[in-house]
């Protein structure tokens, strides 16, 4: 807490400019009017205030806006966002995607902080759903964002937003999340032709049911082993040897290296030895 002291003569700030960089903490507190700061927030980020000085600027804004900052101020916070607590952010109403982007930029490259998580939560709840532009923005800053959501939260993602998802965005998703995302992806990509469809749907297949895998096996997709290993065990078990062979194409030879791992191990145990022998891989059921 900064002590209240009188502003020295001639030091009262007429505008927010670089002369303030040389003010001590107490001088900033005494000589900068909170209303002036709020109206000239667009200048703050261009001025290289020290990390220490940001505390005073935040204190000023808190006094002026005890119920939470207006978006006109929030959009210009820049590095001041680093000083905000989740409690501060819960008072905000952020509606503009540009404001969201500006604040995420400050934390760019770092893992998600509680402040950022709160900001995103407020923003998405305010919008009512995770639209494509928002998802595009969030996964650009945080590739693992989608997989940090619960299946319930994912259910509000409209199929149109799935176009924004890149394979790496799904790297940390678990089967329950893919169960929710897969039907949305299937719907989103339904008008694509066979090979293009497979490229797009591939990273969502951990949520695919048996009948869809059977259908894919008729389309010469040549699924790689990494994708196959991420399929739901219960979806793989009913597939015949012939269907798996068609599904994997030239990659079928990779089954040998994975014969001790799920879902390959469980699938092998379900097959007749005669059928497995047709693969010529020496798999033992």
């Amino acid at each position: 807490e900064v002590e209240k002291t009188a502003c020295p003569s001639g030091k009262k700030a007429r505008e927010i400019d670089e002369s303030l960089i040389f003010y001590k903490k107490w001088e900033l507190e005494a000589c900068v009017d909170a209303a002036l700061l709020a109206t000239q927030m667009d200048r703050v980020n261009a001025i290289p205030f020290t990390y220490e000085q940001l505390d005073v600027l935040k204190h000023k804004l808190d006094e002026l806006y005890p119920q939470g900052y207006p978006e006109s101020v929030i959009q210009h916070l820049g590095y001041l966002f680093l000083k905000m607590s989740p409690e501060d952010i819960r008072k905000w109403n952020v509606t503009s995607l540009e404001t969201l982007k500006a604040l995420l930029e400050v934390n760019k490259g770092h893992e998600m902080s509680p402040q950022v998580a709160t900001l995103i939560d407020r923003f998405v709840k305010g919008r009512g759903q995770l639209d494509k532009d928002t998802l595009d923005t969030l996964t650009a800053f945080y590739p693992g964002y989608l997989c940090s959501l619960s299946p319930e939260e994912l259910s509000s993602v409209p199929p149109s937003s799935i176009w924004a998802v890149r394979p790496q965005d799904l790297d940390t998703c678990d089967p329950r999340q893919l169960d929710v995302l897969y039907p949305k992806a299937r719907l989103a990509f339904q008008n694509m032709n066979g090979s293009e469809y497979f490229v797009k749907i591939q990273s969502f297949l951990g949520g695919a049911p048996t009948e869809d895998l059977k259908a894919l096996s008729q389309q010469n997709v040549s699924m790689d082993l990494a994708t196959f290993m991420k399929l739901r065990t219960d979806a793989v078990l009913p597939l015949t040897v012939a269907e798996v062979q068609k599904l994997l194409g030239p990659h079928v030879e990779g089954l040998k290296a994975e014969e001790r791992h799920r879902p390959v191990r469980d699938w092998i145990l379900r097959q007749r030895q005669d059928d497995l022998d047709t693969l010529g891989l020496g798999l033992q059921g």
Partner: antibody
Framework: EVQLVESGGGLVQPGGSLRLSCAAS????????IHWVRQAPGKGLEWVAS????????LYADSVKGRFTISADTSKNTAYLQMNSLRAEDTAVYYC?????????WGQGTLVTVSS | DIQMTQSPSSLSASVGDRVTITCRAS??????VAWYQQKPGKAPKLLIG???LLYSGVPSRFSGSGSGTDFTLTISSLQPEDFATYYC?????????FGQGTKVEIK
């Protein structure tokens, strides 16, 4: 992809001058702060100077104040360190780095040797 | 100027060990501290810039903690690629200052 590439290092006699360049790509320097940090052989990191190209605001370590000048040409997306009155103790690898507070990207460094 | 004092200045450890490096500021710097890793002949790499948040690509075995004057970088299970020198940096007040470094060597 963000990249910083230093150049201009070399051998110089005490009292001599050198101008180091830091060419940035993958971002525009006027939206960032650019720093020069040096490392004497076998020693730790020492901050030397900083510039905020958007405003031209500069800062210097006491050890180089009055001898070194940091500048930036935003049209070339390049920062510079003009080093005058060089001393033996200025011998170091000089790195340029980017970032308002922490430094998230660094160049590969350029060696400056001050010796007679 | 704010002095940053790291300890130890060097340590020997084995792969799999838990390693802790501390950094003490000569005055309160709140949470304005970053951590870097530097390997011989290479530029430093940012590990942690904001509070205790890892920078992208930094393995989760690294973690940072502390505020005020005492800060810690921990490697939960040392890997061969972690043998390097580690630096803390305060950016709370000008001039920004670095610790003298902690060299982590193979035992």
């Amino acid at each position: 992809e963000v990249q910083l590439v230093e150049s201009g290092g070399g051998l110089v006699q005490p009292g001599g001058s050198l101008r180091l360049s830091c060419a940035a790509s993958g971002f525009t320097i006027d939206k960032e702060a650019i720093h020069w940090v040096r490392q004497a052989p076998g020693k730790g990191l020492e901050w030397v100077a900083s510039i905020y190209p958007h405003s031209g605001f500069t800062l210097y370590a006491d050890s180089v104040k009055g001898r070194f000048t940091i500048s930036a040409d935003t049209s070339k997306n390049t920062a510079y360190l003009q080093m005058n009155s060089l001393r033996a103790e200025d011998t170091a690898v000089y790195y340029c780095a980017r970032g308002r507070y922490w430094m998230d990207y660094w160049g590969q460094g350029t060696l400056v040797t001050v010796s007679s | 100027d704010i002095q940053m004092t790291q300890s130890p200045s060097s340590l020997s450890a084995s792969v799999g060990d838990r390693v802790t490096i501390t950094c003490r500021a000569s005055q309160d710097v709140e949470d304005g501290v970053a951590w870097y890793q530097q390997k011989p002949g290479k530029a430093p790499k940012l590990l942690i810039g904001i509070k205790d948040l890892l920078y992208s690509g930094v393995p989760s075995r690294f973690s940072g903690s502390g505020s005020g004057t005492d800060f810690t970088l921990t490697i939960s299970s040392l890997q061969p690629e972690d043998f390097a020198t580690y630096y803390c940096q305060q950016y709370y007040r000008w001039p920004s200052t670095f610790g003298q470094g902690t060299k982590v060597e193979i035992k």
